[in-house]
């Protein structure tokens, strides 16, 4: 059943999530720079084809309009969704040297947003099924591939970061 | 209430290995990340790696990324570090923390264990 | 790597009197989104470290209120308002903006 903005979400929890939702986006967009600078890859919407050959898939967040907002459905799909780009930044992982401590940061920013979004579905009793493994995740068969990869994950992560801010901005409201 | 116990004690020589275990109790094991930090007697806190458990993922201090091996076992909700070639200065207490974001981070830590290198 | 260095080393105080820790980070922990990822933990004496504040200013659940964190980007103090013999012990600065996480070399309390 749809639940508006003034459903049982404590601010402390909205502002916390605002918050990492921020950094996380700092860090992608820190990462799309490097590989910008030092690869030339600036532009994910060239490499749309290859995101579908390599496989790269998206995070829905089809429970989180504004208007007809599922809350148990939305935080579940942020969940998951948090929880996808776990494994895709992990498929990331040798990408260069360089670009390691912008990636490992990125990897546990992320995963401390799944723990905090998990913490209160947990606390509102409506936590998910714990996920057993990840699904199959993108296979690069060489260095270009992987950092091609790094652009279309990193797109696809601050797009969906966009919209988890705004449904969230939406349910901090008064 | 969240409780991390680690292993005892361990007497080691160089050129071994050690592998220290953390179990928790009190929360939701696979969704929180586990830390490892170290302190050599006298020392500061040094920072050697995390485990996500949820996917298995482990990402190490630089410093230590040929030696530690960070891991974790849902089922028994157990942490596990393991630190290979050892030296006389990994002498050291060598604790695991849960992680977490603002008022979460390492707002829970193990009793330690005192790991001796000595031949 | 984040370098992080605290003053003094090591501080003697007489009970019921101030105390102030400084700690300096060689980078800007302050982030983009308003948030400075700067941390105190005390370990007293035979004990793990426990959190005292997080995010430079924010005191930690069940701290006393004599504790304070403030600072800037790269220069933070935490500052006991009057200390009392329980407060003695190893005090840390560490950040959590990139990792490695990093510590400062800590400072030791000590009553007069």
């Known amino acids: 059943t749809p639940l508006g903005p003034a459903s049982s979400l404590p601010q402390s929890f909205l502002l916390k999530c605002l918050e990492q939702v921020r950094k996380i986006q700092g860090d992608g967009a820190a990462l799309q720079e490097k590989l910008c600078a030092t690869y030339k890859l600036c532009h994910p919407e060239e490499l749309v084809l290859l995101g579908h050959s390599l496989g790269i898939p998206w995070a829905p967040l089809s429970s989180c309009p504004s208007q007809a907002l599922q809350l148990a459905g939305c935080l579940s799909q942020l969940h998951s969704g948090l929880f996808l780009y776990q494994g895709l930044l992990q498929a990331l992982e040798g990408i260069s040297p360089e670009l390691g401590p912008t990636l490992d940061t990125l990897q546990l920013d992320v995963a401390d947003f799944a723990t905090t979004i998990w913490q209160q579905m947990e606390e509102l009793g409506m936590a998910p099924a714990l996920q057993p493994t990840q699904g199959a995740m993108p296979a690069f068969a060489s260095a270009f591939q992987r950092r091609a990869g790094g652009v279309l994950v990193a797109s696809h992560l601050q797009s969906f970061l966009e919209v988890s801010y705004r449904v969230l901005r939406h349910l901090a409201q008064p | 209430q969240v409780q991390l116990v680690q292993s005892g004690a361990e007497v080691k020589k160089p050129g071994a290995s050690v592998k220290v275990s953390c179990k928790a109790s009190g929360y939701t094991f696979p969704i929180y990340t586990m830390h490892w930090v170290r302190q050599a007697p006298g020392q500061g806190l040094e920072w050697m790696g995390y485990?996500?458990?949820?996917?298995?993922?482990?990402n190490y201090n630089q410093k230590f990324r040929d030696r530690v091996t960070i891991t974790a076992d849902t089922s028994t909700s157990t942490a596990y570090m393991e630190l290979s070639s050892l030296r006389s200065e990994d002498t050291a207490v060598y604790y695991c923390a849960r992680g977490g974001y603002g008022d979460s981070l390492f707002a829970y830590w193990g009793q330690g264990t005192l790991v001796t290198v000595s031949s | 790597d984040i370098v992080m260095t605290q003053s003094p080393l090591s501080l003697p105080v007489t009970p019921g009197e101030p105390a102030s820790i400084s700690c300096r980070s060689s980078?800007?922990?302050?982030?983009?989104?308003?948030?400075?990822?700067l941390y105190w933990y005390l370990q007293k004496p035979g004990q793990s470290p426990q959190l005292l504040i997080y995010?430079?200013?924010n005191l930690a659940s069940g701290v006393p209120d004599r504790f304070s964190g403030s600072g800037s980007g790269t220069d933070f103090t935490l500052k006991i308002s009057r200390v009392e013999a329980e407060d003695v012990g190893v005090y840390y600065c560490?950040?959590?903006?990139?990792?490695?996480?990093?510590f400062g070399q800590g400072t030791k309390l000590e009553i007069k």
């Open positions: 995010q430079m200013s």
């Open positions: 980078k800007s922990l302050l982030h983009s989104n308003g948030i400075t990822y």
């Open positions: 485990i996500n458990p949820s996917i298995g993922y482990a």
């Open positions: 560490a950040q959590n903006l990139e990792l490695p996480y990093t």
